[in-house]
């Protein structure tokens, strides 16, 4: 080795990785309202729907104080991670009525990438435990019938809307604590 | 500008003890995983050693597991790899670096040799 | 033996493009966990050339580019030049070892 020299700055450090998540989960949290929003434009939902497969959410009001930043990271991921492949899997199994979004869709799951991106470089970088990336319980097999698709996008897209509302909540209070 | 600078390396029987320390300045220490990586002479990188940015989660290569053991003490900005029970195969330049890692120290060579 | 497989050698002539690649299993790079670079010029220390798959910390050139697909990974050094003689190595973590992992590193000669 040779003499002592230093190294220049990378292009972000774990502060700027929070922010930087921080704005990726509240811009995909405002894509995600407003793709909700269309689907109820056009497929009126009839009352809540639900998928066995998403993840329960992860926070509520009464644990917002007592996050710790591990937790919350290592959970975020995970649950982002399964949301990533039901888009993924709606994108693929969508009939032909879910086609028209499927350009919100497509943007929907590569920002969803950026985000689960970012959290592992924090992770990585904050030396935090990385969890194994998380299979859907149950296999995703195709809809029983277009009604299915419709049920199952309105599912994910509303889980996906408060886990990101939590996610921006609970990210902004890690900032004070990094 | 970011530096990592390594002591404590040195020539040491088979059996013995050695501390690394990393004194760390130029960014926010307290903020990023510390890492102790070698490299066996004409060898690649091995991963050591690697604790998180608050000094709550350590772990361990297989190979140094039950021998080594990393600490920090972010008021000093510095990061420690106390070595027990040396081999010679343990012989190599140690290197300390920070985050994914993204900064890494020029080394200090520890050989262990009777 | 590595956990990360990367070959032994490379190498290519000023201006040509140069590919390392770096094979895994699923519990490291596919387990969508990201992909560093490192590059160590003889007698120094490694130094970050990629990071998360295909970012670049500031400083290096846009003639390094990363990439990820399955259980592997690569490096593409375009427009190759003799100061970019030197070993490259992968790294990401390893669930099943609770760590992270590098693979055995790859020596570039530029002739």
């Known amino acids: 080795p040779g003499p002592p020299a230093g190294s220049p700055r990378v292009s972000s450090d774990p502060r700027a990785d929070l922010d930087s998540a921080v704005l990726l989960t509240r811009s995909l949290l405002a894509d995600t309202r407003q793709l909700a929003a269309q689907m109820r434009d056009k497929f009126p939902a009839d009352g809540d729907h639900n998928l066995d497969s998403l993840p329960t959410l992860a926070m509520s009001a009464g644990t917002l104080g007592s996050l710790q930043l591990p937790g919350v990271l290592t959970r975020l991921r995970v649950d982002l991670m399964s949301y990533f492949r039901h888009v993924q899997w709606l994108r693929r199994a969508a009939g032909p009525s879910l086609k028209t979004l499927e350009p919100e869709l497509g943007a929907l799951q590569a920002r969803l990438e950026r985000l689960l991106r970012r959290l592992q470089l924090l992770m990585s970088r904050l030396a935090l435990p990385q969890a194994a990336p998380d299979q859907p319980a149950v296999p995703l097999g195709p809809p029983a019938s277009a009604w299915g698709s419709i049920r199952a996008a309105h599912a994910i897209l509303g889980g996906l809307h408060l886990t990101l509302d939590w996610a921006v909540r609970g990210l902004l209070l890690l900032k004070t604590r990094l | 500008e970011v530096q990592l600078l390594e002591s404590g390396g040195g020539l040491v029987q088979p059996g013995g003890s050695l501390r690394l320390s990393c004194a760390a300045s130029g960014f926010t220490f307290s903020s990023y995983g510390g890492h102790w990586v070698r490299q066996a002479p004409g060898k690649g990188l091995e991963w050591v050693a690697l604790i998180s940015y608050d000094g709550s989660y350590k772990y361990y290569a297989d190979s140094v597991k039950g021998r080594f053991t990393i600490s920090r003490d972010n008021s000093k900005n510095t990061l420690y790899l106390q070595m027990n029970s040396l081999r010679a195969e343990d012989t190599a330049v140690y290197y300390c670096?920070?985050?994914?890692?993204?900064?890494w120290g020029q080394g200090t060579l520890v050989t262990v040799s009777s | 033996q590595s956990v990360l497989t990367q070959p032994p050698s490379a190498s290519g002539t000023p201006g040509q493009r140069v590919t390392i690649s770096c094979s895994g299993s699923s519990s490291n790079i596919g387990s969508d966990y990201d992909v560093h670079w490192y590059q160590q010029l003889p007698g120094t220390a490694p130094k970050l050339l990629i990071y998360s798959n295909n970012e670049r910390p500031s400083g290096v050139p846009d003639r390094f580019s990363g990439s990820k697909s399955g259980t592997s990974a690569s490096l593409a050094i375009s427009g190759l030049r003799s100061e970019d003689e030197a070993d490259y190595y992968c790294?990401?973590?390893?669930?099943?070892?609770?760590?992270?992992?590098f693979g055995g590193g790859t020596k570039l000669t530029v002739l």
């Open positions: 670096a920070a985050g994914v890692p993204d900064y």
């Open positions: 790294a990401a973590w390893d669930f099943s070892l609770s760590g992270p992992v």
